[in-house]
Interface confidence: low
């Protein structure tokens, strides 16, 4: 007689990351009997929702249902039907919705309300949609990468599961770059966190962690670009903006109304004698870098040390995982290798930005021009943010690891968020230790 495979005793969870530029749905899976173990949850699917972020639906909320359909249907296919009703679904919205809420709490609530109604129509166990704080975004990103790197397990492994993993239990810091905000989170070395807003205390698997975190709203790469354009157009003599952050020969028309649509450009807003202006790229890394630095106010600091804009930042400590747009941009520019020094990265950026737009379009024919045109700015912005904003140096650059996935799971806040909401990270070390981690690591 044929041996029948026993049904897998597994559980699933779904998290939607409603970011400023797009929404992604992640499906996680884990063995039911090992819920409290570290490192057992892994990502089985990512579905990128077609279209912009949910904050863009403010004037067309009736379309949110259709927008979410494809990915929610995909979840229905991936997760066995027998598991649907017990699979939790969480939606967390980040800085795009934080910005919308700053403009109008009522509009943000309306968008979330329609999102909730749409997600409630599916056979899963919908647990709610909410705007997570910048502090949560930083904290959950830190939990995700350290969980996936095995930093919370008490067993020290004699082998390494990822190239940049050290065998000690020192946690990695987390650097997250989105479209509208950026987060820095790490455990400082014996340093008091001088500003209470930036301090988090965790007890995970029997160990205490004092964590520093800050989320810089408006300093995600897309909002930083809007800020830079708004700042630079103030001093333009006419409706032509010669911009060093775009390739020579690149041209793009910008509506002034679009420029001032976001709260992030309010500080630069002025009455201009034109409704539109044209960006004309001149492709100069050094000038682009200088222009970006003007977005960081480093002239005042009420603490022993600051990042920028008067925000406390302790001395950097240990290794850092840089993910989300830090990774996507550097991956596109082929600069994620551990062997590439900061000087080399700067050199490559100088060459890249100086390349004519026509040449760039030919070299990267398959890439959407909207994205392609912004890699010079984004790469330069990443360097400026890490070096001048967070005070990494040429020496400490080697402690930054550009990470897309760890063990097949995306680095980002969503896994940490789900682990927390499903109570899968115990405060104390579980008493019964499973036979061997090696079977599911």
């Amino acid at each position: 007689t044929q041996n029948k495979a026993l049904p897998e005793n597994v559980k699933y969870g779904i998290v939607l990351d409603a970011g400023s530029s797009h929404t992604s749905l992640y499906i996680y899976k884990w063995p039911a009997e090992k819920e409290n173990d570290t490192g057992v949850v892994h990502q089985v699917e990512e579905c990128r929702v077609k279209g912009p972020g949910i904050s863009k639906f403010v004037q067309k909320v009736n379309e949110i249902g259709i927008y979410l359909t494809d990915c929610m249907e995909r979840a229905r296919e991936v997760i066995p039907r027998s598991q649907h009703q017990e699979t939790p679904v969480y939606l967390g919205a980040t800085a795009g919705m934080r910005l919308l809420r700053m403009e109008s709490e009522e509009l943000a609530d309306r968008v979330l309300d329609v999102v909730e109604r749409s997600l409630s129509n599916y056979p899963f166990d919908f647990q709610g949609a909410r705007i997570i704080t910048g502090q949560e975004e930083g904290a959950y990103g830190w939990i995700t990468i350290n969980y996936l790197l095995g930093k919370f397990s008490q067993k020290t492994r004699w082998f390494s599961i990822v190239p940049y993993e050290t065998n000690n239990q020192e946690t990695f810091g987390a650097l997250d770059l989105g479209g509208a905000s950026t987060q820095v989170t790490f455990v400082p070395q014996n340093q008091t966190i001088e500003s209470p807003d930036n301090a988090l205390q965790f007890r995970l698997y029997g160990k205490d962690y004092n964590v520093y975190t800050h989320s810089f709203l408006c300093y995600g790469k897309d909002q930083a670009l809007w800020q830079k354009l708004a700042k630079d157009i103030q001093v333009a003599s006419n409706e032509i903006l010669r911009d060093p952050c775009f390739h020579p020969g690149y041209k793009k028309v910008v509506n002034v109304s679009d420029l001032y649509k976001t709260p992030c450009t309010k500080r630069f807003e002025m009455t201009l004698p034109f409704q539109q202006f044209e960006i004309q790229g001149i492709g100069n890394y050094q000038q682009c870098h200088q222009s970006i630095l003007e977005l960081f106010n480093t002239s005042y600091c009420p603490y022993s040390q600051c990042a920028f804009n008067g925000i406390f930042l302790p001395p950097l400590q240990g290794d850092f995982g840089a993910f989300s747009a830090f990774y996507f941009v550097m991956k596109f520019l082929n600069l994620t290798s551990e062997k590439v020094s900061q000087e080399k990265v700067t050199e490559m950026m100088k060459k890249f930005c100086a390349q004519p737009w026509e040449e760039i379009k030919t070299s990267y024919a398959g890439v959407k021009e909207k994205y392609l045109s912004e890699y010079c700015f984004s790469g330069t912005y990443i360097l400026s943010l890490l070096l001048q904003g967070y005070h990494f140096t040429a020496d400490s650059w080697e402690h930054i690891h550009f990470i897309g996935k760890i063990q097949g799971s995306d680095a980002g806040w969503t896994l940490g968020y789900m682990l927390n909401l499903t109570n899968m990270i115990p405060a104390e070390q579980p008493l019964s230790t499973p036979l061997s981690h090696s079977t599911y690591v």
């Epitope: 530029s21 279209g51 897309d222 041209k251 028309v253 910008v254 960006i279 890439v367």
Partner: nanobody, 135 residues
Amino acid sequence: QLQLVESGGGLVQPGGSLRLSCAASGFTLDYYAIAWFRQRPGKEREGVSCISSSNGNINYADSVKGRFTASRDNAKNTVYLQMNSLKPEDTAVYYCAADLSAAPYNDAVRSCTGGSRLRATYDFWGQGTQVTVSS
């Protein structure tokens, strides 16, 4: 002065043909996604044909597939819509639109479906040209 100017509309019998042009001045069309839309009497404005900026891919609404052909002439800074086998239900004001949005990573829907979501991605419009198909 930045503008899009459509021309080529008019009265035509069912089964006939027309060629619409959309000329841009003040900016170069080849950098942008361009679409043809139409607004039929009493109906919402709908996408007819969408030309992607990155690879020149052209999408058509199901109702015009096989009958309408969009093209662009970058040297003349003009896009065209060749309309064959016209039907009375093609009667509408035809607009060309450019996606000039500086919104980074605002992933425009290029399939020429999506109603107002599609319309919202195009932020610069011509004044329109009337096409009437009648015997």
